[in-house]
């Protein structure tokens, strides 16, 4: 959870209107009872806005009262809005719910940018659109904040879907999801398709839009094309993976392949950018730079402060290079590939001054924390969390936008040696030195 | 310097009233959260009650929840403790004491420096 | 709520002693605990905040160590300046609670 802003990201229409929907491919993998299939009532159940966040409705309490929380992969806490705030249009109040249990600790969460602080208690949690369950979940009622509420988003809360390990105050605070599947039949997985409208929302089409789909316990064969691959998680914490080779239009970044995960790489639906280890960025800027030169762009650009823009509906895709993710795969020397397109990692803004424009963002950035696959990688795929099986599958997004030319893509096999070699050994500090991401 | 000056102590029935005050001044009031701490008479020190930097937060020992209220006019750089149904047990110094940041759970947001107390003596 | 338990009640030591003051708590309380040393008439000072960070002008001669119920402030070679009164305190649970204190007098 990551940039500039880390939590805050983006999302939008469901539909790809300026690109276009793939045909539905045959799934060559084996069925899974109660694991794939349909799961129509969870189809389309997040909306967002870009740059700020993909949010579910979730309800909590007795009476239920209802919130918009932000789904974030890359924290472990699932806390709301519980005092008034100049961003919040409503927030949780403990004091008219009969089933909430006071556990008397206090809690407070740093990001890189933002933070917020809070009191612990439990409560009745569910999903309206999601399974049929209630839970008893760790709340942190969020009494204090800085710069996390974002004004417009239209979310009061986070669910932070990732593991213990990571959870404050520490990692005895167990995260909804353990809840959920402790306390239910709900398989130990969610998938997530995250969908970029392409262009900027306002604030009316963003409530009337779709954003994509959380399906909790199971695969949904509609909102993807092709077959999924699979990464092993490598450590249950945040959700890490493995990159082993990136590759800017075919051309690899020849890196050792360690400076790739250093210090981590992480799948997190909370960040909006692409963001990647400082050589790494440097050596992609200089590549997609390279690959983009008839055209010259500002270094504020390159930076993400910038923005750049065409006359609408002339933006020249074509000039801008896919990259290219190698990922570990579940079978030893074997590797896949995730593709995406300048759709992706091109984030559509509005310019106030020239909105008869197509203005756009670059959504890669630098970090110092490792590589965090935010939305820009996951607008392009359905993402599937299998917790279960300690691995993360990606497939071609039935909703991400592209154009006649050229579509994301997950490929492979692909023999890659020495892919242990990859993943960087973090040193072991003291455990409140671990800053949640955010950026 | 940080200096925090507590006043409005004295003496009070059991049953009454009194509000504390606590006047700031050397620092950024509104960015620190502040607290409240007593010490009965030859006795150790007992936690009262806290409030984050924005007020947004506060919080109270079971002993007085209900009874007191803690508040702050970050406007007049002044943090407050209303005491009502006071009793005989209530007696005390009461001192102030400044948060770290404006958090209350930050790791080293803990409460320094403190007011030299006020005394409240709660007796018929 | 969490209590903390400070032995001994009292310590008494004679200058450039080593003292070792003792806190337990009731319950895990991570490392969300602090020294304060507080002399007769006056208020209070921090010495130690997060179980073993020392504050801002306090001398190397206080260390504290420990985390969850075992926790130990040592002054490691006693100054005519530390006889006081010392308290820890706990904020990771309601109500933050004190312990009931340890004297370190003059032996």
């Known amino acids: 959870t990551q940039h500039g802003i880390r939590l805050p990201l983006r999302s939008g229409l469901g539909g790809a209107p300026l690109g276009l929907r793939l045909p539905r491919e045959t799934d060559e993998e084996p069925e899974e009872p109660g694991r794939r299939g349909s799961f129509v009532e969870m189809v389309d159940n997040l909306r967002g806005k870009s740059g700020q966040g993909y949010y579910v409705e979730m309800t909590v309490g007795s009476p239920p009262q209802t919130l918009n929380i932000l789904v974030d992969t890359g924290s472990s806490n699932f806390a709301v809005g519980a005092a008034p705030h100049p961003f919040l249009h409503r927030y949780y109040q403990r004091q008219l719910s009969s089933t909430y249990r006071d556990l008397r600790k206090g809690v407070y969460v740093p990001y890189t940018q933002g933070k917020w602080e809070g009191e612990l208690g439990t409560d009745l949690v569910s999903i309206p659109h999601g399974p049929n369950v209630t839970v008893r979940a760790n709340i942190a009622a969020i009494t204090e904040s800085d710069k996390f509420f974002i004004n417009g988003s239209n979310w009061e809360g986070i669910l932070g879907l990732a593991y213990a390990e990571i959870a404050r105050p520490d990692d005895s605070l167990e995260p909804f999801f353990d809840s959920l599947v402790k306390q239910t039949h709900v398989p130990n997985l969610f998938s997530l398709q995250l969908c970029g409208a392409g262009f900027p929302l306002n604030q009316s089409e963003v409530l009337a839009s779709v954003g994509g789909s959380m399906i909790i316990g199971g695969i949904d064969h509609s909102l993807y094309t092709g077959s999924l691959w699979y990464t092993p998680i490598r450590r249950e914490w945040y959700y890490e993976v493995i990159i082993v080779r990136v590759e800017i239009n075919g051309q690899d970044l020849k890196m050792d392949c360690k400076e790739y995960n250093y210090d981590k790489s992480i799948v997190d639906s909370g960040t909006t950018n692409l963001r990647l280890p400082k050589k790494v960025f440097e050596a992609a800027v200089k590549s997609i730079k390279a690959a983009s030169s008839t055209e010259k762009f500002p270094d504020g650009f390159w930076l993400g402060e910038q923005l750049v823009c065409w006359q609408a509906g002339t933006t020249p895709w074509n000039i801008f290079p896919v990259i290219s993710l190698y990922l570990m795969g579940e079978v030893t020397n074997q590797s896949f590939r995730i593709t995406i397109l300048p759709q992706q990692y091109l984030r559509p803004v509005e310019d106030v001054a020239t909105s008869q424009d197509d203005c756009y963002k670059f959504a890669i950035s630098q970090s110092s924390t490792g590589t965090v696959m935010g939305a820009v990688i996951m607008e392009g795929f359905y993402v599937v969390f299998d917790r279960a099986r300690k691995r993360i599958g990606f497939a071609v997004s039935a909703c991400h936008v592209h154009d006649e030319f050229r579509t994301a893509a997950v490929e492979g096999p692909f023999v890659t040696l020495d892919m242990e070699d990859c993943g960087y050994n973090i040193p072991q500090t003291d455990e409140s030195t671990l800053m949640t991401g955010r950026a | 310097e940080v200096q925090l000056l507590e006043s409005g102590g004295g003496l009070v029935q059991p049953g009454g009233s009194l509000r504390l005050s606590c006047a700031a001044s050397g620092f950024t009031f509104g960015s620190y959260a502040m607290s409240w701490v007593r010490q009965a008479p030859g006795k150790g020190l007992e936690w009262v009650s806290a409030t984050s930097g924005s007020g947004g937060s506060t919080y109270y020992a079971d002993s007085v929840k209900g009874r007191f209220t803690i508040s702050r006019d970050n406007s007049k750089n002044t943090l407050y403790l209303q005491m009502d149904s006071l009793r005989a047990e209530d007696t005390a110094v009461y001192y102030c004491?400044?948060?770290?940041?404006?958090?209350?759970?930050?790791?080293?947001?803990?409460?320094?420096?403190w007011g030299q107390g006020t005394l409240v003596t709660v007796s018929s | 709520e969490i209590v903390l338990t400070q032995s001994p009640a009292t310590l008494s030591l004679s200058p450039g002693e080593r003292a070792t003051l003792s806190c337990r708590a009731s319950q895990s309380v991570s490392s969300y605990l602090a020294w304060y040393q507080q002399k007769p008439g006056q208020a209070p000072r921090l010495l130690i905040y997060?179980?073993?960070n020392r504050a801002t002008g306090i001398p190397a001669r206080f260390s504290g160590s420990g985390s969850g119920t075992d926790f130990t402030l040592t002054i490691s070679s006693l100054e005519p300046e530390d006889f006081a009164v010392y308290y820890c305190v706990q904020r990771s649970n309601f109500p933050w609670t004190f312990g009931g204190g340890t004297k370190v007098e003059i032996k």
């Open positions: 004491a400044k948060g770290g940041s404006q958090w209350l759970y930050a790791p080293g947001s803990w409460f320094d420096p």
């Open positions: 997060d179980a073993s």
